[in-house]
């Protein structure tokens, strides 16, 4: 089981939408896949996929989940608020037929406020 997550870095304006994608691949078929999105280490949602469908469509505040066969799990945040800023990780585990788990790399989401002066001050505070 392998999980690839993207993008690595996402910068969006407050009130717009952000899309995080997790690609889940396994050489053999699976009957049930448990998936999990975390933000800054806290679980946003932990649904499973079976018979081609997600057991849950929501994921955290303003978050919508979708599964597109063969391998794409998408988390869409809409509308994005300042509180959505953080480090997101996608995790997946095949529960049936045999336990296999893997997680993606971090997606760092930065949300720019509507006020351009706040935006300038905020960006200046980031190193590099």
């Amino acid at each position: 089981l392998s999980v690839q997550q993207g993008p690595n870095l996402l910068q969006v304006r407050q009130g717009s939408q952000a899309t995080l994608v997790c690609q889940v691949d396994q050489a053999t078929a699976w009957e049930r896949l448990r998936v999990k999105w975390t933000k800054d280490g806290a679980i946003l949602c932990q649904p499973y996929i079976t018979n081609g469908s997600l057991s849950l469509g929501v994921c955290g505040p303003q978050g919508r989940l979708s599964w597109q066969a063969p391998s794409h799990l998408t988390l869409q945040l809409d509308p994005v608020s300042l509180n959505h800023s953080g480090a997101y990780v996608c995790w997946a585990a095949v529960e049936i037929p045999e336990l296999e788990e893997a997680e993606g790399n971090i997606t760092r989401l930065f949300v720019d406020p509507d006020d351009p002066t706040q935006n300038r001050n905020r960006i200046a505070s980031f190193p590099g």
Epitope: D25, A29, W30, L33, N51, A69
Partner: antibody, heavy 120, light 113 residues
Framework: QVQLQESGPGLVKPSQTLSLTCTVS??????????WSWIRQHPGKGLEWIGY???????YYNPSLKSRVTISVDTSKNQFSLKLSSVTAADTAVYYC????????????WGQGTLVTVSS | DIVMTQSPDSLAVSLGERATINCKSS????????????LAWYQQKPGQPPKLLIY???TRESGVPDRFSGSGSGTDFTLTISSLQAEDVAVYYC?????????FGQGTRLEIK
């Protein structure tokens, strides 16, 4: 371009352990999401999957051979190996190493194969 | 274990004619989760390792001539060579990767009539 090459003795005595090594070139064996596999073909017969080792080190073996098979990886040499214990004449075959990806499930790259004969 | 059964065991076809090889699995190889069939086809010539031709039942591997095509879903699959060439003489195998143990068909020997 991924290349695989099997090596090891072509003759093994009954009851001994068959040991083969597959050297991978053009690709790092530590790359995530790959299964390093062994498949055999008895003379004039079809293909039999022996087992594979995943990037994580987890192994999967054919239940028909599981009690006798060990597959391992040597990342420093970019190699993986097969050991088959307590061999009999029925283990005489051409042994292939091959690779398989999580994004696939099919064997895209194969070694040329090596004939191992079990005989006293 | 999933049993893969090919038919016929051997086949003789004239150059330029169509060759059809069938493969039947003992259980469905289609996943409703990924919407894929977990089936591949290989060609093996004497003294050589098998060569991947088709995956996902119908997707041609890069570099494989377009006279080779795969079709089918669930338990019944077909490999078709639309116009047989001399270099197509070989043994053809289907393989399932729906589950472990991975299993192959017994092979179909294709010859020129």
């Amino acid at each position: 371009q991924v290349q695989l090459q099997e090596s090891g003795p072509g003759l093994v005595k009954p009851s001994q352990t068959l040991s083969l090594t597959c050297t991978v070139s053009g690709f790092s064996i530590t790359t995530g999401g790959y299964y390093w596999s062994w498949i055999r073909q008895h003379p004039g017969k079809g293909l039999e999957w022996i087992g594979y080792i995943y990037t994580s080190g987890r192994t999967y073996y054919n239940p028909s051979l599981k009690s006798r098979v060990t597959i391992s990886v040597d990342t420093s040499k970019n190699q993986f190996s097969l050991k088959l214990s307590s061999v009999t004449a029925a283990d005489t075959a051409v042994y292939y190493c091959a690779d398989m990806a999580d994004k696939g499930g099919w064997f895209a790259y194969w070694g040329q194969g090596t004939l191992v004969t079990v005989s006293s | 274990d999933i049993v893969m059964t090919q038919s016929p065991d051997s086949l003789a076809v004239s150059l330029g004619e169509r060759a059809t090889i069938n493969c039947k699995s003992s259980q469905s190889l289609f996943s409703s989760n990924t919407k894929r069939n977990y089936l591949a086809w290989y060609q093996q010539k004497p003294g050589q390792p098998p060569k991947l031709l088709i995956y996902h039942a119908s997707t041609r591997e890069s570099g494989v001539p377009d006279r080779f095509s795969g079709s089918g879903s669930g338990t019944d699959f077909t490999l078709t060579i639309s116009s047989l060439q001399a270099e197509d003489v070989a043994v053809y195998y289907c393989q399932q990767h729906y589950e472990t143990p991975l299993t192959f068909g017994q092979g179909t020997r294709l010859e020129i009539k």
